[in-house]
């Protein structure tokens, strides 16, 4: 009888290893199946565009990856109050699982838009390193289904590249013109959104709580209109310390007023960058490794 | 409140140059737009340049334009107006003034907008 028992228990912890290993094959599986299906989809890096079928919906591109697909791409999401999927960029290195929200990358696309472009979102959402602003209310759908840490990485013409992070970023609704929320901020390349870097400064430059202007719709707070000054529609304040959808110069410039892609913080006023990533990720966002 | 001081100003011959320095001491004066003012025995104190808090952007009263030059010096924490050409009409009280963030953008340059004054430099021009 103790001969059985025994033999049992041996034959258990079999078929728990068997099932494990089968488990583990058929992660293998499906992640060869889904490099092929993306291999096959993926045209090098001109066009990334990654068409998962209707197999189910994602919020963002935090659930894609945890769904197992590795590859950055062009995916469709569809956030929780969002009436229609859109398509965004999703990074899935620097521990994957970004929803890419801002690129710029050469200056191909006119950021110098109305009302309407921001809230709608335009730009190359085909192209690996296209331009595009994702739009103010998919910022506000995303944004309002789960806290997210905003990640904003960025490169100067010689070679330089550093990154700001914020947590709890927030995009407000129409009624509210699109107001922007922050939280803690971390990184290398200075709190240029929170305006901290300077006591004198924040009141007139801090980006925190600011509604969207543009050209057409002016919602800043100084006697002319920022967003008319400085050819791109932001969350100016009076101006900015930070505009990252500036006009697209190469390093220094000169201009009537400070116009280019600006991280006062790192640059100052009179430098435009060459490269700015704005992505996000949930607060608590764990990779699924298994 | 921004603490400004003017110096430079005197006694000067007619066709003649003074330069006038707006000074800030414990501030940036980058983070602020600076205009230069003047006020007339009897008249209204009325606008005569200013630079954007950036330094991209200057404008200058029709009566100075071509005499006057407005300029910034980071380093120094200064903004100095170079006046050329001096012209009887142009004494006065010369008072520079600070408003936080974007400004002068247009002519003309009203004083409502600053908030921030120093208490100005007296500018005699006389032969």
């Known amino acids: 009888l103790e001969d059985c028992a025994q033999e049992q228990m041996r034959l258990r912890a079999q078929v728990r290893l068997l099932e494990t290993r089968v488990k583990q094959q058929q992660v293998k599986i499906k992640q060869l199946l889904q490099e092929n299906e993306v291999q096959f989809l993926d045209k090098g890096d001109e066009n990334t565009v990654i068409d998962l079928g209707s197999k189910r919906q994602y919020a963002d591109c935090s659930e894609i990856f945890n769904d197992g697909y590795k590859l950055s791409g062009f995916y469709k999401i569809k956030p929780l109050q969002s009436p229609a999927e859109f398509s965004v960029y999703c990074d899935m290195s620097d521990g994957g699982g970004w929803t890419v929200i801002q690129r710029r990358s050469d200056g191909s696309e006119n950021f110098n838009r109305g009302w309407k472009d921001y809230e709608n979102g335009f730009g190359n959402f085909v192209q690996k390193h296209g331009e595009y602003w994702l739009g103010n209310k998919n910022l506000h759908f995303l944004t309002t289904q789960e806290d997210y840490t905003l990640k904003i990485d960025l490169a100067d013409f010689e070679k330089n590249s550093r990154y700001a992070q914020y947590k709890n970023f927030k995009v407000g609704d129409e009624k509210n013109f699109y107001e922007l929320n922050i939280g803690e901020y971390s990184g290398t390349a200075g709190d240029s959104l929170a305006g901290n870097f300077h006591p004198e400064v924040q009141w007139w430059a801090s980006h925190q709580r600011m509604k969207f202007s543009t050209w057409d719709r002016d919602h800043d707070n100084y006697e002319g209109n920022c967003a008319e000054e400085d050819q791109s529609g932001w969350w100016f304040n009076r101006c900015h310390s930070a505009n990252l959808n500036g006009v697209y110069y190469s390093g220094p410039y000169t201009a009537k007023t400070d116009n280019g892609i600006v991280w006062y913080t790192w640059h100052g006023w009179w430098y435009s960058l060459k490269s700015v990533v704005m992505k996000i990720r949930p607060n608590d966002f764990i990779p699924n490794v298994i | 409140q921004v603490q400004l001081v003017e110096s430079g100003g005197g006694l000067v011959q007619p066709g003649g140059s003074l330069r006038l320095s707006c000074t800030a001491s414990?501030?940036?004066?980058?983070?602020?737009?600076i205009g230069w003012f003047l006020q007339a025995p009897g008249k209204e104190r009325e606008g005569v340049s200013c630079i954007s808090n950036s330094g991209g952007s200057s404008v200058y009263a029709d009566s100075v334009k071509g005499r006057f030059t407005i300029s910034r010096d980071s380093a120094k924490n200064t903004v100095y107006l170079q006046m050329n050409s001096l012209d009887p009409e142009d004494t006065a009280v010369y008072y520079c003034?600070?408003?936080?963030?974007?400004?002068?953008?247009?002519?003309?340059?009203?004083?409502?907008?600053?908030?921030?004054w120093g208490q100005g430099t007296q500018v005699t021009v006389s032969s």
């Open positions: 003034a600070a408003l936080a963030g974007r400004g002068c953008m247009r002519s003309p340059i009203t004083t409502d907008e600053y908030d921030s």
């Open positions: 414990g501030f940036n004066l980058d983070f602020y737009t």
